[in-house]
């Protein structure tokens, strides 16, 4: 299996944005790559977002996706937006080298994203 590296822990910003790098050790000369972000929480795995891109080009997520990203060589910089405390969990980067054959699959160990909801601003009386 292809090796995929990602950071162990990331803290989301107060605006609910978390960014991390997913890096894969490409054993072949892929031209088309698919990146999928999976969330594992309470032994349940769900797909957060996915994008297919041509090497050297931008990642294209669906319009309603909470993810954005850029690619550079064998690195993908992923950003997940709109996170809330309940979204805290392990976010796994899955990379597939689709074309040309052969197919390679790599799954990272996951990045634990901690999301802390901001404290509401206290009402002020002037």
């Amino acid at each position: 299996a292809m090796h995929v590296a990602q950071p162990a822990v990331v803290l989301a910003s107060s605006r609910g944005i978390a960014s991390f790098v997913c890096e894969y050790a490409s054993p072949g000369k892929a031209t088309e790559v698919r990146v999928t972000v999976l969330r594992q929480a309470d032994s349940q795995v769900t797909e957060v977002c996915a994008a297919t891109y041509m090497m050297g080009n931008e990642l294209t997520f669906l319009d309603d996706s909470i993810c954005t990203g850029t690619s550079s060589g064998n690195q993908v910089n992923l950003t997940i937006q709109g996170l809330r405390a309940m979204d805290t969990g392990l976010y796994i980067c899955k990379v597939e080298l689709m074309y040309p054959p052969p197919y390679y699959l790599g799954i990272g160990n996951g990045t634990q994203i901690y999301v802390i909801d901001p404290e509401p601003c206290p009402d002020s009386d002037f």
Epitope: T31, E32, T52, Y53, M54, M98, Y99, P100, P101, P102, Y103
Partner: antibody, heavy 118, light 107 residues
Framework: EVQLVESGGGLVKPGGSLRLSCAAS????????MAWVRQAPGKGLEWVAF????????YYADTETGRFTISRDNAKNSLYLQMNSLRAEDTAVYYC???????????WGQGTTVTVSS | DIQMTQSPSSLSASVGDRVTITCRAS??????LNWYQQKPGKTVKLLIY???RLHSGVPSRFSGSGSGTDFTLTISSLQPEDVATYFC?????????FGGGTKVEIK
């Protein structure tokens, strides 16, 4: 139910052109790579061309490179094969097939016959 | 290109017989070996992918095995509806290539 229906085949003179079409239904077309495979009379199967789901990747058999062009219109659930400079040896039944598993073709159409003859 | 050699090119067996078809690749194709069935005058159907995985709706009497360069398609108990030509195909490298086919008939 997955359905693939080819059309556009016919009799053409050497050096002529044809455009084959494949209408897909019963699945989300834009999620799948698609291929054209041909079968000459009484012969085996020969892969012709492949296009990935978003048309990022396109590949051809060596003998077809430069003469054939595979394309797709995901909005119309359609696959195409533009064939130029046709030769007698291009005479075959042309099948469109879905690449539902990496590098395997899991559903095939009934085929459309192309005859190149003077 | 990777050459795929199938044998035998044709065979005749009785209903209930165990039938074996072999496919040899000219180089290692890992697990990217698929088997297809084409009944007379009909289209092509995927039977087995990744050496041994049955495609949906395929009867369990069909099975696949092998590794590297040598692969086998087995019909454990031949049925009249299995009369067809069977093709192997490699998906390891482009161009994707097929075996020459094995025509299976009933005695």
């Amino acid at each position: 139910e997955v359905q693939l229906v080819e059309s556009g085949g016919g009799l053409v003179k050497p050096g002529g052109s044809l455009r084959l079409s494949c209408a897909a239904s019963g699945f989300t077309f834009s999620d799948y790579g698609m291929a054209w495979v041909r079968q000459a009379p009484g012969k085996g199967l020969e892969w012709v061309a492949f296009i990935s789901n978003l048309a990022y990747s396109v590949y051809y058999a060596d003998t077809e490179t430069g003469r054939f062009t595979i394309s797709r219109d995901n909005a119309k659930n359609s696959l195409y094969l533009q064939m130029n400079s046709l030769r007698a040896e291009d005479t075959a039944v042309y099948y469109c097939a879905r690449s539902g598993l990496p590098y395997a073709m899991d559903y095939w159409g009934q085929g459309t016959t192309v005859t190149v003859s003077s | 290109d990777i050459q795929m050699t199938q044998s035998p090119s044709s065979l005749s067996a009785s209903v209930g017989d165990r039938v074996t078809i072999t496919c040899r690749a000219s180089q290692d194709i890992s697990n990217y070996l698929n088997w297809y069935q084409q009944k007379p005058g009909k289209t092509v159907k995927l039977l087995i992918y990744y050496i041994s995985r049955l495609h949906s709706g395929v009867p369990s009497r069909f099975s696949g095995s092998g590794s590297g360069t040598d692969f086998t398609l087995t019909i454990s108990s031949l049925q009249p509806e299995d009369v067809a030509t069977y093709f192997c195909q490699q998906g390891r490298m482009l161009p994707w290539t097929f075996g020459g086919g094995t025509k299976v008939e009933i005695k």
